[in-house]
Interface confidence: medium
């Protein structure tokens, strides 16, 4: 194994303005009794989590994609966005076996895979929130302004999706540029960010930009759009449309529950590193532990959307049953009477809501 050259890595890097200590020798009162701490979780437990999420996500998102692609007739705009959402989750899930293996054996896959799987993880998050922001805009235009523009111009939706993937790649670019396999002296190699001599400055710039454009901005768009959408639905007593919106609201709610805690902690970490929040040893350790505790929710998210569709999305269940019946896996008699080959919800005109 190649040995790690300390001079090449983060020279003059000012990681912090505090110091940590391990077990101190007796009677050394002037040494800070603090050391880096993160959650102590058994690596095999982590591997089990990865394996479960991988299997659930692979099965669930494959089915979602199958049902949407199978239902060509009456496929809504939201369906197209959810297809892309499932695609992003599936791509991320495919990297989980690699992360699981790395947890046990260290990063044995080299720099190329290090860059690729890290990129997929970032792209999954950014495309996810940007697609949900687009769904919120689409629902806002359809319900609040009764606009049919997007629905009538499907090429525009394809352009929007392409733009989302491009922007997600752009936001995830720092990972592609700076991640590499780092060979350490006494432990297994790691897939890590090496930004050269200006790590702290780079990390701040490359964290603030994605957090602003890839999290805070889409979040504000979603809050604005769904705020007005809900107000319109309740004011107009549009019960049918409200029911049709249940799945979308559930998808957004689960996304926020899974990703908001992590990104709020990350924001606190960013504020502390930029000295906008006073940095203390206790605070640093609390943030480290919170990052570990909240990141698992983000990982779990990739397998949750199909479960939402299965439990809340009536049309998804119908669509799935239709496919099973088409292939003779179940009797056609067991199909609901109103089952159609898509999972478009009931709503007026071209403003259909998915699942």
């Amino acid at each position: 194994m190649q040995s790690f050259n300390f001079e090449d890595f983060w020279e003059n890097e000012d990681f912090s303005n505090y110091s940590y200590s391990s077990d101190l020798p007796p009677s050394l009162p002037d040494v800070a009794p603090c050391r880096p701490e993160s959650l102590e979780i058994n690596k095999y437990f982590v591997v089990i989590i990865y394996a479960l999420v991988f299997l659930l996500s692979l099965l669930g998102n494959s089915l979602v994609m199958l049902v949407i692609l199978h239902s060509r007739v009456g496929r809504s705009i939201t369906d197209v966005y959810l297809l892309n959402l499932a695609m992003a989750d599936l791509l991320f899930a495919l990297t989980l076996p690699i992360w699981a293996a790395a947890k046990v054996n260290g990063w044995i896959f080299g720099t190329f895979l290090c860059k690729v799987v890290s990129l997929l993880k970032e792209v999954n998050f950014y495309s996810g929130i940007l697609l949900l922001a687009c769904i919120s805009v689409d629902r806002y235009l359809a319900i609040v302004h009764a606009t049919r523009t997007l629905t009538q111009k499907r090429y525009l939706v394809k352009f929007v999706c392409l733009s989302i993937w491009s922007l997600s790649l752009l936001l995830a670019l720092p990972v592609l540029l700076f991640r590499r396999t780092v060979y350490l002296t006494y432990i297994s190699p790691v897939c890590y960010e090496d930004m050269g001599n200006n790590t702290a400055k780079w990390r701040m710039v490359l964290r603030i930009l994605p957090q602003t454009f890839g999290f805070i901005l889409p979040l504000l768009i979603m809050l604005f759009c769904y705020g007005f959408t809900l107000r319109t639905l309740f004011k107009a007593h549009m019960g049918q449309k409200h029911r049709a919106m249940r799945v979308i609201f559930a998808v957004v709610l689960i996304f926020l529950l899974c990703w908001l805690p992590y990104h709020l902690v990350l924001l606190a970490d960013t504020l502390m590193r930029t000295r906008l929040i006073n940095e203390t040893c206790q605070r640093r350790n609390n943030i480290d532990q919170a990052l570990d505790a909240t990141e698992i929710l983000g990982i779990l998210h990739s397998c949750l959307n199909p479960l939402i569709y299965a439990f809340i999305g009536q049309k998804f269940r119908h669509g799935l049953l239709k496919i099973l019946a088409t292939h003779g896996l179940i009797s056609k008699d067991s199909l609901p009477k109103d089952s159609r080959p898509s999972f478009v919800g009931s709503s007026s005109g071209h403003t259909s809501t998915t699942l």
Epitope: W10, S19, Y20, L39, E295
Partner: nanobody, 126 residues
Framework: EVQLVESGGGLVQPGGSLRLSCVAS????????MGWYRQTPGKQRELVAD???????NYIDAVKGRFTISRDNTKNTVYLQMNSLKPEDTAVYYC????????????????????WGQGTQVTVSS
């Protein structure tokens, strides 16, 4: 968990020599400064010498010309070569290092910590 292990201490006659070694192990990304401190009973510890990753060296006046600090970055090790030892050099010698370590369950992050060894006894006596 990061550990610093010292070795090389012992009993030596005045004018003799000893070589102390300190090896750092664990989830180490990088070691910034490594140094040697000493402490005698009832007194505060004092810095003997330290060396940065860039090779900048600092000694206290009492040991200049007699002690030499060096480090091997590839082995995460710091050495203290002690020549012309005097009875007043008798103390417990502690290794100290400012280390960038990896923390994190899902995503690994770098954090700086200040770590200490358990100490090695150096006795200069005839």
């Amino acid at each position: 968990e990061v550990q610093l292990v010292e070795s090389g201490g012992g009993l030596v006659q005045p004018g003799g020599s000893l070589r102390l070694s300190c090896v750092a192990s664990g989830s180490i990304v990088r070691i910034n400064t490594m140094g040697w401190y000493r402490q005698t009973p009832g007194k505060q510890r004092e810095l003997v010498a330290d060396i940065t990753s860039g090779g900048n060296i600092n000694y206290i006046d009492a040991v200049k010309g007699r002690f030499t600090i060096s480090r091997d970055n590839t082995k995460n090790t710091v050495y203290l070569q002690m020549n012309s030892l005097k009875p007043e050099d008798t103390a417990v010698y502690y290794c100290n290092a400012e280390i960038v370590v990896l923390v994190g369950v899902w995503t690994q992050r770098a954090r700086t910590g200040n770590y200490w060894g358990q100490g090695t006894q150096v006795t200069v006596s005839s």
